[in-house]
């Protein structure tokens, strides 16, 4: 699987929450940001993440679709330097500073059940989508006899209406 | 290379049923999304129903819902549209796409020609 | 829902000129829109995805732009085959066509 161009095909800022409508957060706590998955209060703003879309091309070989086996990968940035990362190892996600280009850990294949109802799954470790497990994020992985819409890899992405990226 | 090819179409009675399908060619079929698209004569073009690659989620044009179905045979790479209930503003060209990427509902990258749907009495 | 409204509905214009089409959406469509030729008793085809990318095959005459609600296709030089119907799409929330413009060559 590679990245068809060095430039992502679009981006925009979303808010994050969980299948359940919860928000996930980020935090900086001690040099390093932490993410949550928590419940906010009524007013409490959601924090945003930039989600930047790639064209992968899929190795024909493997897909039986010549050059025609395309899919998105997608990268989320909550904020400047700083993108989510799958530690494999861990089966953790977690949020960490990279330069361009980003490691492959940092790209997830983008799944969805609807245009705002999503799954991320690792492009390192195909099979492994992010799950929210004991109010964290969690890499968890997906038999493929299951089906995806099992609620603890689904993400809802809205809108927002700030252009900047924070 | 990519082919869809629609079949089922014909003149059918108000109320009558029909069942199209659409066989897929030139590519993993189980990967895509698949979705029925339909033109009324001389009109626009009017999304009518959507299923994912692996057929567990499906979604319809309010003004289908309840009478038309989609489903798919990954093993024969073919989407179908079970059509009930048929009314006469039913009648259209109805197309069958591809999504344009594995596993998302982005873009309708590739079209069969079409087959006529006529609901009248 | 959200709804697609294209202008104009009729473009007339002469081969070499650069012509303009707009969509607005009802809502932030968040640059998930496309861009879809007909030509008569043909299927459509897919020119343009995600606001601005050239799907392979397509002249770089074809090109679009936009964000937010307000979206454009642009032909830099009108030919003779690109009279057809020109539909925007967008699938940020469900899936909603336009109406169509109609390009005419004068």
């Known amino acids: 699987m590679s990245i068809t161009g060095i430039s992502p095909i679009t981006e925009y800022l979303a808010s994050l929450s969980t299948y359940n409508d919860q928000s996930i957060t980020f935090a900086l706590e001690d040099e390093s940001y932490e993410i949550y998955v928590e419940d906010l209060k009524k007013d409490e703003k959601k924090d945003k993440v930039l989600l930047s879309y790639y064209e992968s091309q899929h190795p024909s070989n493997e897909s039986g679709d010549g050059v025609d086996g395309k899919m998105l990968m997608v990268t989320l940035s909550p904020t400047k330097d700083f993108w989510l990362h799958a530690n494999n190892k861990e089966h953790s996600v977690e949020l960490h500073k990279s330069e361009k280009p980003l490691p492959d850990q940092a790209f997830f294949v983008l799944h969805n059940m609807h245009s705002n109802s999503v799954s991320f799954e690792s492009k390192t470790d195909p099979g492994v989508f992010i799950g929210v497990k004991d109010n964290h994020l969690a890499l968890i992985k997906v038999d493929s006899s299951e089906n995806l819409s099992t609620e603890n890899i689904l993400f809802k992405l809205s809108e927002t209406h700030h252009h900047h990226h924070h | 290379e990519v082919q869809l090819v629609e079949t089922g179409g014909g003149l059918v009675q108000p109320g009558r049923s029909l069942k199209l399908s659409c066989v897929a060619s030139g590519f993993t079929f189980s990967n895509y999304w698949m979705y029925w698209i339909r033109q009324a004569p001389g009109m626009g073009l009017e999304w009518v129903s959507s299923?994912?690659?692996?057929?567990?989620?499906?979604y319809y044009l309010d003004s289908v819902k309840g009478r038309f179905t989609i489903s798919r045979n990954n093993a024969e790479n073919t989407v179908y549209l079970q059509m009930n209930s048929l009314r006469s503003e039913d009648t259209a060209t109805y197309y069958c796409?591809?999504?344009?990427?594995?596993?998302?509902?982005?873009?309708?990258?590739?079209w069969g020609q079409g087959t006529l749907v006529t609901v009248s009495s | 829902d959200i709804q697609m409204t294209q202008s104009p509905s009729v473009l007339s214009a002469s081969v070499g000129d650069r012509v303009t089409l707009s969509c607005k959406a009802s809502?932030?469509?968040?640059?998930?829109l496309d861009w879809y030729q007909q030509k008569v008793g043909e299927a459509p085809k897919l020119l343009i995805y995600?606001?601005?990318n050239l799907q392979t095959g397509i002249p770089s005459r074809f090109s679009g732009s936009g964000s937010g609600t307000d979206y454009t296709l642009t032909i830099s030089s009108l030919q003779p085959e690109d009279v057809a119907t020109y539909f925007c799409?967008?699938?940020?929330?469900?899936?909603?066509f336009g109406q169509g413009t109609k390009v005419e060559i004068k």
């Open positions: 796409a591809r999504g344009h990427y594995y596993y998302t509902s982005y873009s309708f990258a590739y």
């Open positions: 995600f606001t601005n």
């Open positions: 799409f967008q699938y940020n929330s469900g899936w909603t």
């Open positions: 809502h932030n469509i968040n640059k998930h």
């Open positions: 299923i994912n690659n692996d057929g567990g989620n499906t």
